[in-house]
């Protein structure tokens, strides 16, 4: 499946649009809002009742090359006594982002957009039971 | 830019860094993953720090629909189902990359844009600053 064309009738394709070969698109990877920073509450990964660790994955043929993934530390959640309570479950919260993948075919290079699922952090949930046999 | 290993047999003219502008195949790899968090799981309702999901739509962006989480309570839900204000529900934020049509309205010309989204909420012990 492809990126949808602009579907709204009030959109007219401007004359200023750059010419693009069929089946591809022009992508400027100079990021808008590059310097925007996350303003999350301090150390929430350690203070959470469903704490998590971070792992950095690095791939030189991906842009951006660095993607940070979270992993829940526990199966249960941390109770008021600081102990793991397995009547509740720590679960990962995930979000999709886009990356640009560089592919080498012989000496030629092509670029592909890719959706990547990033685990952002964890939350504590009531477990659900699906099938009792 | 990002340095990458070059095939030793290839001409030296190849740039080791990602160029500023690239031509990209219109097909997106892993395109068919579920983008609606309400359908993919019900964690937002089952969490001790539950959240509501708000639809943010922008036809000049890909993906055009992004779901934003807003924590329902200041506190967290305790074992009795009540809000406990000794704990705090806080949003988990993430920077993601999206495509922005540039120039505007152009069907096949985009620029990467970094946006900040709240993905969900988690229950944390509050930081209490003591006043001397």
């Amino acid at each position: 499946r492809k990126i949808p064309k602009v579907g709204h009738t009030f959109f007219q394709k401007p004359e200023s649009c750059p010419p693009v070969p069929g089946g591809s698109m022009k992508l400027d990877i100079g990021i808008i809002n590059e310097n925007q920073r996350v303003s999350m509450s301090r150390n929430i990964e350690s203070r959470s009742t469903s704490p998590w660790n971070y792992t950095v994955t690095w791939d030189p043929n991906r842009y951006p090359s660095e993607v940070v993934q979270a992993q829940c530390r526990n199966l249960g959640c941390i109770n008021a006594q600081g102990k793991e309570d397995i009547s509740m479950n720590s679960v990962p919260i995930q979000q999709e982002t886009l990356v640009v993948r560089r592919k080498h075919q012989g000496c030629s290079v092509s670029f592909q957009l890719e959706k990547v699922l990033v685990t952002v952090g964890c939350t504590c949930v009531t477990p659900v039971i699906h099938h009792v046999q | 830019g990002i340095t990458i290993p070059r095939n030793p047999g290839c001409p030296n003219s190849e740039d080791k860094n990602f160029p500023r502008t690239v031509m990209v195949n219109l097909n997106i790899h892993n395109r068919n993953t579920n983008t609606n968090p309400k359908r993919s799981s019900d964690y937002y309702n089952r969490s001790t720090s539950p959240w509501n999901l708000h639809r943010n739509e922008d036809p000049e962006r890909y993906p055009s629909v992004i779901w934003e989480a807003k924590c329902r309570h200041l506190g967290c839900i305790n074992a009795d189902g009540n809000v406990d204000y000794h704990m705090n529900s806080v949003p988990i934020q993430q920077e993601i990359l999206v495509l922005r049509r540039e120039p505007p309205h152009c069907p096949n010309s985009f620029r990467l844009e970094k946006i900040l989204v709240s993905v969900g909420c988690t229950c944390v012990t509050p930081i209490v600053h003591h006043v001397a």
């Epitope: 829940c72 526990n74 199966l75 479950n89 720590s90 679960v91 990962p92 949930v125 477990p127 659900v128 039971i129 699906h130 099938h131 046999q133 | 799981s41 964690y43 089952r46």
Partner: nanobody, 118 residues
Framework: EVQLVESGGGLVQAGGSLRLSCGAS????????TGWFRQAPGKEREFVAV????????AYADSVKGRFTISRDGAKNTMYLQMSSLKPEDTAIYYC???????????WGQGTQVTVSS
């Protein structure tokens, strides 16, 4: 569809030990996590032990900590619950369960009765 079958339950004296086994047929334990829970007549269901497959992380209910041990044998497609220093209050039906994704326990066995006499 995965079928879970428990075995190893029985009658034991207080202070004694039992080892429960849980086998998977029609599939494998290639899930996110596995665990044991128990239910005594007129009491709430209680998870007693859980194990995450990716890293072997284990956790226990306070009531059994230090006495019960959850383990697995991937080659035999079997999970175990070693129970020692058993108490009369451990009397219950014990069920094994698997979660194919976090927070969602998909499959349960039919249960095995454990009775601890004083």
């Amino acid at each position: 569809e995965v079928q879970l079958v428990e075995s190893g339950g029985g009658l034991v004296q207080a202070g004694g030990s039992l080892r429960l086994s849980c086998g998977a047929s029609g599939g494998t334990f290639s899930s996110y996590a596995t665990g044991w829970f128990r239910q005594a007549p007129g009491k709430e269901r209680e998870f007693v032990a859980v194990l995450r497959w990716s890293d072997g992380h284990t956790a226990y209910a306070d009531s059994v900590k230090g006495r019960f041990t959850i383990s697995r044998d991937g080659a035999k497609n079997t999970m175990y619950l070693q129970m020692s220093s058993l108490k009369p209050e451990d009397t219950a039906i014990y069920y094994c369960t698997t979660a194919t994704r976090p927070g969602e326990w998909d499959y349960w066995g039919q249960g095995t009765q454990v009775t601890v006499s004083s």
